[in-house]
């Protein structure tokens, strides 16, 4: 988890100002209105190899 202004969240996650921590972009399927989901739209998901080993 990152503080604002430091290194970005890990791949597949995005910073939530509301929750003050990095959140998994995968959760945007269930909660698309979450503040961090805007950041997820611009970021790629986790590497392909992690999902299809």
């Amino acid at each position: 988890e990152q503080a604002p202004g430091t290194a970005p969240c890990s791949r597949g996650s995005s910073w939530s100002a509301d929750l003050d921590k990095c959140m998994d972009c995968a959760s945007c399927r269930a909660r698309p209105k979450s503040d961090f989901c805007l950041g997820c739209a611009a970021a790629p998901p986790a590497p392909f190899r992690l999902l299809w080993p």
């Epitope: 597949g12 509301d18 998994d24 995968a26 959760s27 399927r29 269930a30 909660r31 986790a46 999902l51």
Partner: antibody, heavy 119, light 111 residues
Framework: QVELVESGGGLVQPGGSLRLSCAAS????????MSWVRQAPGKGLEWVAE??????????HYAESVKGRFTISRDDSKNSLYLQMNSLRAEDTAVYYC??????????WGQGTLVTVSS | DIQMTQSPSSLSASVGDRVTITCRAS??????????MHWYQQKPGKAPKLLIK???NLESGVPSRFSGSGSGTDFTLTISSLQPEDFATYYC?????????FGGGTKVEIK
Amino acid sequence: QVELVESGGGLVQPGGSLRLSCAASGFTFSSYWMSWVRQAPGKGLEWVAEIRLKSDNYATHYAESVKGRFTISRDDSKNSLYLQMNSLRAEDTAVYYCTGYYADAMDYWGQGTLVTVSS
Amino acid sequence: DIQMTQSPSSLSASVGDRVTITCRASQSVSTSSYSYMHWYQQKPGKAPKLLIKYASNLESGVPSRFSGSGSGTDFTLTISSLQPEDFATYYCQHSWEIPYTFGGGTKVEIK
């Protein structure tokens, strides 16, 4: 430090009622979906009920096995979750866990409270 | 409802062994980007603890010897080098739809 503390379990006769409570602390309760998950003695985990947020009009969902008998509710002002259990059956005997999660995976779990339905 | 089939139901292993547990869903629980499968560890008399979410994302504080993989219907939890504190029961769970369902559990015992 996240903490979920269940209470209200005990021995109840078949057909009886019980109300479980879960007191939450250490996270933004009002932003998290909450569920009850149960575990019968020596058995696996079974999801029971879920309640979402105020912005979702506190939408609720239930397992078929408890629909019409159990009611899940929450009080965000008290950081508390509840499970009203009516028409209890022997097969409802289990440890009941309160769980919290933003979505999908259940991040936070209480220690559980035992409900025994027996005559 | 989506059925979750875990195998084996129990296994005996020694400290240092590599352990693999599998979970099969009765239908796909993945999108093109993410898999809605999670793994928990439960020790006797204790509440379950989340280990891995979205098939492969290790929870904060969980040792790196735990890893998860898979997509679609077939998923795997691997413990690369079993430690004494890893003897427990492990459950998979999907969050693709309501009702959420868990696998039957895999009990990892000391050989």
